[in-house]
């Protein structure tokens, strides 16, 4: 046969479904690797071809369109499963060609079990909440297409393994869950059960997102740094080890650009002919606002490098400060028994 | 004097995989992020993707993210990007850039550039 | 994302002129802006950073001002050597956003 171009194994999409539910699952050509969709592929004599590689084997082989009650079926460019089993995991390629042209790309499948509680290694995608920031919603996800708009089908919202009745500050709204006021106590798991009928049977559909409260944008501030400050001197004598912390917080701000560096005489260290290292630790709080501290040593500081300038510099989305640290050469204390043994002068 | 230089462009078929590699002198380059951005031909400049000093954290635009890695080699001095399943889009001219110290994120030097070319 | 957008895309002007250059973020970004500037065939350049900053060695004629959302470039006596490209970058968010350019050509 011609060439085909070879898109490989998608990594990208490693498709996770549940078992005993149904899936649709698009060919991922026309939505990431063709300019062109599949009605024009079509409507150009363009064919589309789906086969299989099972877990664990190395042999393609055709997907079974022949199977009761057509459990597997093919519409468009969606490969459809009515419902899925657990071997049916394995790696799926869809094929456009005719005569003359040839694209194809193969993808990951996996038939997940979930307990009764919706625990299962499904990766859970994370839907991020302001914290008291008023009324925010999460939506049931990638639940389209299943069935038509003249379907009403029934949703059950989930946190965790119970049921959402009566919640205070979280309510069910059809595909919608409101959160009228997001709390810290509403970090979790949150699963919506879709029930809907068709030909005569009931599917449902499972879905869990997990909800994180962070810090709201309201509350965001520009960076703080709480060390060095104007109460600690790095107080030292030539010779012994500088250490000075640069402590910043951050307010969460979605995406923002953290930065933390050090200046020495208003100069990169690099610049500077002296040996420094600087270490880097990163932490977060519950609502993900960041700490960095950043640590400039100097192993043997001389008398020079106690008088140089130590500045520590922040920058975020919200704005830059800075901050220069109180450093100087320890005064060597008075020897007194020198004087003492002196003063008294024996004859 | 400061130096970056670009270099593993070409022509390459949809679906392939390329790397790029961009060799540095004349600063100290394991104190600055660096970055890749690129340009498809008479368009404007997107930014492509960036990596810490110790490569601890690496960023990518979206239309990248989990085909295309970052990396760094700071022995070296340089400065990768592994390219896969590449697509047409992903069509320009790839520059190296070096991450201004004092709170990066702006390109203070550049190199010239190469040119990835995807096509059947 | 957020979204960068600079104005004009395309300005006519002669040698002398005053040139304003205006680049809007779709939401704040501080004082994280940088201007560059490209010529064809060349790799871009940076003039200023931190909005207002002027990169050494960029001559004085070129100024940027702004903040939050609103941005400018101006160049105070446009010379021969300025007809080219100038974008606009934000890199107080990830990602690194440039604006879609603006060519400055002789009138």
């Known amino acids: 046969s011609e060439r085909c171009d070879d898109w490989g194994l998608d990594t990208m999409r490693q498709i996770q479904v549940f078992e005993d539910e149904p899936a649709r699952i698009k060919c991922p050509l026309f939505e990431h690797f063709l300019k062109f969709n599949y009605s024009t592929a079509h409507s150009a004599g363009l064919t589309l071809i789906w086969y299989w590689t099972r877990q664990d084997r190395d042999l393609e082989e055709p997907i079974n369109f022949r199977l009761p009650e057509n459990r597997i079926s093919k519409e468009k460019d969606v490969l459809w499963f009515r419902p899925t089993l657990l071997n049916d995991t394995g790696n799926y390629t869809c094929m456009l060609r005719n005569t003359t042209y040839c694209s194809k790309v193969a993808f990951p499948l996996e038939v997940v079990q979930k307990d009764s509680c919706f625990n299962s290694p499904m990766k859970l995608p994370v839907h991020k909440l302001y914290i008291e920031y008023g009324i925010q919603r999460i939506t049931c996800p990638n639940v389209d297409g299943y069935f038509p708009s003249s379907v009403k089908p029934t949703i059950t919202w989930y946190m965790g393994c119970y049921k959402i009745q009566n919640f205070n500050n979280v309510i069910p709204e059809g595909m919608n869950l409101s959160f009228l006021i997001a709390l810290i106590s509403n970090n979790g798991n949150y699963t919506c059960v879709v029930t809907y009928p068709e030909n005569g049977r009931t599917f449902h559909l499972t879905r869990t997102l997990t909800v994180k409260v962070v810090g709201s944008p309201k509350n965001a501030v520009p960076p703080v740094i709480h060390s060095p400050n104007d109460h600690v001197v790095y107080e030292k004598e030539p010779g012994e080890e500088l250490l000075i912390p640069c402590t910043v917080y951050f307010s969460f701000l979605m995406d923002s650009r953290n930065e933390v560096w050090w200046t020495i005489d208003g100069k990169k260290p690099d610049d500077i002919t002296i040996d420094v290292t600087i270490n880097e630790s990163i932490s977060h709080s519950r609502t993900e606002d960041e700490t960095r501290t950043q640590i400039l040593s100097i192993k043997k500081v001389t008398s020079e490098d106690l008088k140089r300038s130590y500045v520590c510099h922040a920058r975020s989305a919200k704005g830059e400060v800075a901050k220069a640290a109180k450093v100087k050469q320890k005064v060597p204390a008075p020897r007194y028994t020198v004087e003492l043994a002196c003063g008294f002068g024996a004859t | 004097e400061v130096q970056v230089v670009e270099s593993g462009g070409g022509l390459v078929q949809p679906g392939g995989s390329l790397r790029l590699s961009c060799a540095t002198s004349g600063f100290t380059f394991r104190s600055y992020w660096m970055t890749w951005v690129r340009q498809a031909p008479g368009k404007g400049l997107e930014w492509v993707a960036n990596i810490k000093q110790d490569g601890s954290e690496r960023h990518y635009v979206d239309s990248v993210k989990g085909r295309f890695t970052i990396s760094r080699d700071n022995a070296k001095t340089s400065l990768y990007l592994q390219m896969s399943s590449l697509r047409a889009e992903d069509t320009a001219m790839y520059y190296c850039?070096?991450?201004?110290?004092?709170?990066?994120?702006?390109?203070?030097?550049w190199g010239q550039g190469t040119l990835v070319t995807v096509s059947s | 994302d957020i979204q960068m957008t600079q104005s004009p895309s395309t300005l006519s002007a002669s040698v002398g002129d005053r040139v304003i250059i205006t680049c809007r973020a779709s939401q704040s970004i501080s004082r994280g802006l940088a201007w560059y500037q490209q010529k064809p065939g060349k790799a871009p350049k940076l003039l200023i950073y931190?909005?207002?900053n002027l990169e050494s060695g960029v001559p004085s004629r070129f100024s940027g001002s702004g903040s939050g959302t609103e941005f400018t470039l101006t160049i105070s006596s446009l010379q021969p050597d300025d007809f080219a490209a100038y974008y606009c970058q934000q890199y107080s968010y990830y990602s690194h956003t440039f604006g879609q350019g603006t060519k400055v050509e002789i009138k």
């Open positions: 850039a070096r991450e201004g110290y004092y709170g990066s994120g702006y390109f203070d030097y």
């Open positions: 931190k909005a207002s």
